[in-house]
Each structure stands twice: as C-alpha cells, then as structure tokens.
C-alpha cells in the first residue's frame, strides 16, 4: 500500500461559500470517501472555515498507510467582498467597455495570494480592471471573470454588456 | 520583497516640467490601485494624484489637476507622474503608495524623491 | 473639501507614559456603506510613513497591541498605552471616506519630555 502522504499528494479542493453563513466549505476532489482526523469531513467536505484562516486537515484511507496527507486549507476572502462593476464611461459606451472587480471591504488574507481573470471573447486578460476600446457599436459583448486564492478559483461572475449606438455620422 | 523606489526628482524653474517615476517589485503591480503623496518643507502630507489598477480611473485635488498627470505601465511595473506648470509651492519630498483599492489603506511607500521648484 | 484638524501639534512625554492624539474632521466621515475610513500613520525621522490603525481602530499587520484606535463621527483618537522610544516620531489621521478627496491631517509630534 502506498502512504497516504502519497497517494494524496497532489490532491485538489474547491472552495464553496455559503451567504447565510459566511463560511467555506472545501470541497476535497478524491474518488473514495476519506477521513479526515481531527477536522470532521462529510462525503469529503470541510465545513465552516472561516475566511482567511488557515485550516489543517489529515487525510487518511484504509487504501493508503500512515502517514496521513496534512493538507493546509488556504481560505479565501468572504465572496461578498468582491464585485463585478461597469466602470464603463457613458460617453464611450458605444465602442468601449470597462470591468473592474471592487474590494467593498477589507480582510486580511494576503492580497498577494490573489489573482483576478477575465475572458471576453477570446481575448484572456489576468487583471483586476480591464478596458476593451475599439469595439463595434451596438454589439452584444460576454465576459466571463473569476477570482483565484494560491490558485483555487472561489469565485465568478458574467456580463453581458450591449454596448450603444454610434453617434449618427459615424 | 515589496519595494517602490522613486526617481526623476530635481531642481526646476516655476513654470517648469518634471516626469516622476515610481519603480514597483515584489508584488502583482497590476492588482493594486496607487497614489502620490507628497510632504511639504513644512512636513505636512498631502495627496497628489490617484489612479485604479488597470489606469481606468484618475483622481486629481484641485490644487494640481489641470497640471499634473498619473498614469502607469503594468508590463514595466511602473507608476509615473508628470508635472507641468509647476509652482514654488509644489516643492515637496514625492512618495507614491500603494493601496488594495479605494476602501483600503497606504500599506507600502517608497523612500520617496525631493522636488524643489525654485528660480 | 474634508480638513483634518489634529492636536496637539507637539506632544511631549515620558517613556512608559500613556499618549493621546486627536483628529477632527470638518465633517462626518461615516461613508454611506456605514464603514468609517479613517487611518493613522507614524513616520519616524528620516522615514517614509507607515499604517498604524485602518478603519477607526483595526491594527494593522506587525502593530505593537499599545496602539489603539477609537472615535466615530466627526472624532478620532489615537493611544499609545505605554510610549517606547521606538514610536517617537510624526503621527498622521488619514481620511479615506470621501473618494477621491483623500486629506491629511497636519500631524502630531511624539517627542521626549
């Protein structure tokens, strides 16, 4: 049998947020149910982890030897202290269109740990703000955004943005 | 490390121009919205210019809007402020600050860089 | 625009003392989202400046638990529970509320009595 170090070793997780609770839930993407030592895991989710507080957790399996898999769970940041927001300008609307993620509040995860995405079309671009110019008027522009914690996406958003007529003569 | 480090500070005359530069390291330059602030002889602070991380967004106080100008380059992990029309009165040690976004906190500073404006 | 009115211009005391410093806005800078962006700096001679204490009263990373942060309003106060010779040096209230009018106030010198 392998070590459960092992046989874990590159495990993954997903990290799923609850509103109400403003906790985490991670996810721990493995095939088999496991165990997970002193943190109680349910059909292999970590409940209740508070934002921006490290988490450990054994993983253990009777396919797999001692020593168990200590994974640290890097929580991310509240979801609610992000939004997606249009800074597009009103009189570039029709050939200009502005996204901006907006920290609403403060936390104390490390800022540096977070990475921002947004695909538009298939233009792909890792910043916090982006401002696509030179587009066609009166066109039907999708951008898909994500946010990412050490790498784990913990959040997402879409914009459908039309953008305005041309101005007559253009 | 996280480091900003200015340059481009000099003597020039009234009515004069002057580029300011602001070298970023050690952390994603392009997540992070960032300000100049400059300190008086008299060591008072005061917020020059502002601008959002992808340079969508520029905020001026009325007493340099019109002659001062921040912009960055996020592919060189710079920040700049150019100054024109430049008064006695905008003789100051520069700093320029980085901030998470508008509802943060000037959490690092450079070492800043001394204009004197002056005939 | 928002003035920051800070006293006094000079504080002088002994190591181990307790120290105060006030800030008063011209006016409330309770933002409409409920949160109070007021901020205090230190910048020690020769120094740039560096955060203390973020919305009223949350210590920054790093910040000795003597510096305390308190006020609401239009009202700030800075504590300093027992003054070591490392905090001698300029102390500043930022206000952040009304963006992008960011506005300093005058400062306040913590020096030996």
């Known amino acids: 049998k392998p070590t459960c170090d092992e046989k874990y070793a590159n495990i993954t997780v997903d990290y799923l947020y609850n509103k109400e609770t403003k906790l985490f839930t991670a996810k721990l993407n493995v095939n088999e149910r496991v165990e997970c030592g002193n943190n109680t895991c349910t059909n292999n989710e970590v409940h209740n982890l508070t934002e921006c507080k490290n988490a450990s957790v054994s993983i253990s399996h009777n396919s797999c030897t001692a020593p168990d898999k200590t994974l640290i769970l890097d929580v991310p940041p509240g979801v609610e202290k992000f939004q997606l927001h249009d800074c597009t300008q009103v009189e570039k609307a029709d050939t200009t269109i502005c996204l901006k993620w907006k920290n609403i509040e403060t936390f104390t995860c490390d800022t540096q740990n977070i990475t921002y995405r947004f695909q538009c079309g298939n233009m792909i671009f890792d910043n916090k703000e982006i401002k696509l110019e030179n587009l066609e008027p009166e066109h039907e522009y999708k951008c898909d955004s994500e946010i990412l914690y050490n790498n784990h996406k913990f959040t997402n958003a879409s914009k459908i943005i039309k953008t305005d007529f041309g101005s007559p003569g253009e | 490390e996280v480091q900003l480090v200015e340059s481009g500070g000099d003597l020039v005359k009234p009515g004069g121009s002057l580029k300011l530069s602001c070298a970023a390291s050690g952390f994603a330059f392009s997540n992070y919205d960032m300000s100049w602030v400059r300190q008086t002889p008299e060591k008072r602070l005061e917020w020059v210019a502002y601008?959002?991380?992808?340079?969508?967004?520029?905020y001026y106080p009325d007493t340099v809007k019109g002659r001062f100008t921040i912009s960055r380059d996020n592919a060189k992990n710079t920040l700049y402020l150019q100054m024109s029309s430049l008064k006695s009165e905008d003789t100051a040690m520069y700093y320029c600050a980085r901030r998470y976004d508008v509802w943060w906190y000037f959490d690092v500073w450079g070492a800043g860089t001394t204009v004197t404006v002056s005939s | 625009d928002v003035l920051m009115t800070q006293t006094p211009l000079s504080l002088p005391v002994s190591l181990g003392d307790q120290a105060s410093i006030s800030c008063r806005s011209s006016?409330?800078?309770?933002?409409?989202?409920?949160?109070?962006?007021l901020e205090w700096y230190l910048q020690k001679p020769g120094q740039s400046p560096k955060l203390l204490i973020y919305?009223?009263?949350n210590r920054f990373s790093g910040v000795p638990d003597r510096f305390s942060g308190s006020g609401s309003g239009t009202d700030f106060t800075l504590k300093i529970s027992r003054v070591e010779a490392e905090d001698l040096g300029v102390y500043y209230c930022f206000q952040g509320s009304h963006v992008p009018m960011y506005t300093f106030g005058g400062g306040t010198k913590l020096e030996i009595k």
């Open positions: 006016q409330s800078i309770v933002h409409s989202n409920g949160n109070t962006y």
């Open positions: 601008i959002s991380s992808g340079g969508v967004s520029t």
């Open positions: 919305k009223v009263s």
